[in-house]
């Protein structure tokens, strides 16, 4: 049965031009983490495998950083930037759990600055 | 076109140390982990390890933890592949690989260095 | 470690066959894994990647199928430049296990 939940940043808005960092956490259970894909629609940005270390999708190495922990840090932020995130953590034994963060990104600078996880 | 060429074969002794180079090109050398994975004759196919060209970082087999060493020069686009107290059983052809874009297989190989380990 | 058990180890054919090589993974893989071609004296070649997308260059006739523990490649219509060894790989867990092959032979 799985019992746990993901806690994610939520709905979060950032400045054109600047980094932000997507963040879930996985709680309320005792499943072992085996990997964690980080996707964007349906294009992969970047896996952290517990064995294996991280993989960052070429086409977006240049602007995403591995961490802080299992999150990613996207960087140089565009417009075209603004959309659905998803972390999906690979447990063992429960199976897969999924979290979504929305993100928009502001051509102005009053980006609201609410996000827990965000870097200024 | 994507090109992965390997160093020539060696033979040596047990206890001696070899080390592979494998060189790319027709990518953009950072952008992609390189691995080594080998193969005894008449075999199958066994990993080895994966290296960052960009950070250096290296993921090591648990089994080869304690003798192999994985390297990069940047400025060659060429990544080696040493292992150390070589033994008889490491009698293999030695494959360097390039990390696909989705995920830890394989999706460009060099041709092969045919290590032999004899006395 | 995650085993990856191919099966048959060799099988024979013809021109023109439909041909299905199975793989078994000792626990849940997802849909992460990878098939690989090699002929005699040469590198292996990746055909397909997540169990089902087929790699850049990979005939039609090649596909891929399954998740979680049982996998299947199909050769839809077996052509001479088929015949080679096939190989499985889960690519998403140390130490990157590879199944024992199943060698393609003529007829």
């Known amino acids: 049965m799985m019992t746990g939940t993901i806690e994610t940043t939520g709905n979060i808005s950032a400045e054109k031009g600047g980094s932000i960092i997507l963040q879930c956490h996985l709680s309320s259970t005792t499943a072992q983490v085996t990997q964690v894909n980080w996707e964007q629609q349906d294009q992969l940005l970047a896996i952290c495998n517990a064995d294996l270390g991280w993989h960052i999708s070429p086409s977006f190495k240049d602007r995403v950083a591995p961490g802080p922990g299992l999150g990613l840090t996207l960087q140089s932020l565009t417009v075209n930037d603004t959309g659905e995130y998803f972390c999906i953590y690979h447990t063992y034994p429960d199976g897969t759990y999924t979290g979504r963060i929305f993100l928009e990104v502001l051509e102005s600078s009053v980006a609201e600055h609410g996000a827990r996880f965000q870097i200024p | 076109e994507v090109q992965l060429v390997q160093s020539g074969a060696e033979v040596k002794k047990p206890g001696a140390s070899v080390k592979v180079s494998c060189k790319a090109s027709?990518?953009?050398?950072?952008?992609?982990?390189m691995h080594w994975v080998r193969q005894a004759p008449g075999q199958g196919l066994e990993w080895m390890g994966r290296?960052?060209?960009?950070?250096?970082?290296?993921k090591y087999n648990e089994k080869f933890k304690t003798r192999v060493t994985m390297t990069v020069d940047t400025s060659t686009s060429t990544v080696y592949m040493e292992l150390s107290s070589l033994r008889s059983e490491d009698t293999a052809v030695y494959y360097c690989?390039?990390?696909?874009?989705?995920?830890?297989?394989?999706?460009?190989w060099g041709q092969g260095t045919l290590v032999t380990v004899s006395s | 470690d995650i085993q990856m058990t191919q099966s048959p180890s060799s099988l024979s054919a013809s021109v023109g066959d439909r041909v299905t090589i199975t793989c078994r993974a000792s626990e849940n893989i997802y849909s992460y894994l990878a098939w690989y071609q090699q002929k005699p004296g040469k590198s292996p070649k990746l055909l397909i990647y997540n169990a089902r997308t087929l790699a850049e260059g990979v005939p039609s006739r090649f596909s891929g199928s399954g998740s979680g523990t049982d996998f299947t490649l199909t050769i839809s219509s077996l052509q001479p430049e088929d015949f080679a060894t096939y190989y499985c790989?889960?690519?998403?867990?140390?130490?990157?296990?590879f199944g024992g092959g199943t060698k393609v032979e003529i007829k």
């Open positions: 290296i960052d060209p960009d950070s250096t970082g290296s």
């Open positions: 027709g990518y953009t050398f950072t952008n992609y982990w």
């Open positions: 790989q889960y690519h998403s867990g140390s130490p990157l296990p």
């Open positions: 690989a390039r990390e696909g874009a989705y995920g830890y297989y394989f999706d460009y």
